[in-house]
Interface confidence: low
């Protein structure tokens, strides 16, 4: 159930509201918890959660990733730095949140719920970056022939494909939590 | 190598102070985060306090608010912890504790000092 | 300051997997972190951010966390893995860190 919609907020109608903050806090919570039901059905299905870092690293996949510059960290905090990278990452992901679509089977309705409560995620963060003009949008023509790219690879790759985009999303998501949090 | 020493500990009366020092090597003290986390004997651990990397905010557990200060000097590579009107539940060992590359708000402990024993008792 | 709730001890067969779970409100929210500590020793981080191993730390130890609850698995446990086992959190507001009361684990055999 997406954030806001559980039956404990229908039952206090008394609550106070979520602040923009706490959705946001909220949103990626759930994107979360779906990333790890997607984990379990990819590690169960091959052995790639047991492949070693160093291997993993082998692959040329561009998935976004934090780092010192990026402002997100303790140290070297940067607000504004940080919120265009957390944006400009989520948009990054979309592409390969779209590759997991038909990557799954008894997952398939969570694979979808990652990939609209990430939209939804995006929504949110551009209200509080509505003053930021660094924000670059990916390519649609250069996403959609990475596509293609990522759909052509044989099963082990795929596999892999799925278990690394799974894995530095995570990671990445659990950065922008902390981040955010400083916001 | 992250090493954190702690020092200052020792015997004090009730109603008596004492100052903690955790001295700091082996990163970039300024950018991080400090917490002190205390053990009462045969007890688990109790965050006591902590402060963020520039020192201007702090916070406290509701136990010792208002009778402990944290501080810390990033020139020396220091964090402190003053301690007055002690009590006889305030005896525990005393851990200096590094935060993770984390948020401020969201802190996790990458690295402790081997503790300073505190003890309250007349 | 909200508390987090553990088991006060917990024994296991070598070999076998150890489930210690720690419960608390602020757990809906916030990450879970665990640390091990063995007697006259200082804590060590061994999972945070509800599943994330820090170099160093064996394999065997992962962690997890769902609607305000947050277990930390040691599958195959070994005989250096007995001691005491605390999760750790920030409170709701974030203005305070919480531990929880600590699980002494026991390995048998």
């Known amino acids: 159930v997406p954030p806001g919609e559980d039956s404990k907020d229908v039952a206090a109608p008394h609550r106070q509201p979520l602040t923009s903050s706490e959705r946001i806090d909220k949103q990626i919570r759930y994107i979360l918890d779906g990333i790890s039901a997607l984990r379990k059905e990819t590690c169960n299905k091959s052995n790639m959660c047991e492949s070693s870092k160093e291997a993993l690293a082998e692959n040329n996949l561009n998935l976004p990733k934090m780092a010192e510059k990026d402002g997100c960290f303790q140290s070297g905090f940067n607000e504004e730095t940080c919120l265009v990278k957390i944006i400009t990452g989520l948009l990054e992901f979309e592409v390969y949140l779209e590759y997991l679509q038909n990557r799954f089977e008894s997952s398939e309705e969570q694979a979808r719920a990652v990939q609209m409560s990430t939209k939804v995620l995006i929504q949110f963060l551009q209200k509080k970056a509505k003053n930021l003009d660094a924000i670059t949008t990916p390519d649609p023509t250069t996403n959609a022939s990475l596509l293609t790219k990522l759909q052509a690879q044989n099963q082990w790759l795929q596999d892999m494909t799925t278990h690394l985009i799974l894995r530095s999303f995570k990671e990445f998501l659990q950065s922008s939590l902390r981040a955010l949090r400083q916001m | 190598e992250v090493q954190l020493v702690e020092s200052g500990g020792g015997l004090v009366q009730p109603g008596g102070s004492l100052r903690l020092s955790c001295a700091a090597s082996g990163f970039t003290f300024s950018s991080y985060a400090m917490s002190w986390v205390r053990q009462a004997p045969g007890k688990g651990l109790e965050w006591v306090s902590a402060?963020?990397?520039?020192?201007?905010?702090?916070s406290y557990a509701d136990s010792v608010k208002g009778r402990f200060t944290i501080s810390r000097d990033n020139a020396k590579n220091t964090l402190y912890l003053q301690m007055n009107s002690l009590k006889p539940e305030d005896t525990a060992v005393y851990y200096c504790?590094?935060?993770?590359?984390?948020?401020?708000?969201?802190?996790?402990?990458?690295?402790w000092g081997q503790g300073t024993q505190v003890t309250v008792s007349s | 300051q909200s508390a987090l709730t553990q088991p006060s001890a917990l024994s296991v067969t070598l070999g076998q997997t150890a489930k210690i779970t720690c419960q608390g409100g602020?757990?809906?929210?916030?990450?879970a972190h665990w640390y091990q500590q063995k007697p006259g020793q200082a804590p060590v981080l061994v999972i945070y951010d509800d599943d994330s191993r820090p170099s160093g730390i064996p394999e065997r130890f992962s962690g997890s966390s769902s609607g305000g609850r947050a277990t930390l698995t040691i599958s195959g446990a070994q005989a250096e893995d007995e001691g005491d086992y605390y999760c750790q959190s920030a409170d709701s507001s974030g203005n305070a860190s919480v531990f929880g009361g600590g699980t002494h684990l026991t390995v048998l055999g």
């Open positions: 402060i963020n990397s520039g020192g201007g905010s702090t």
């Open positions: 602020s757990l809906g929210t916030r990450y």
């Open positions: 504790a590094k935060e993770g590359d984390t948020g401020w708000k969201d802190p996790m402990y990458d690295y």
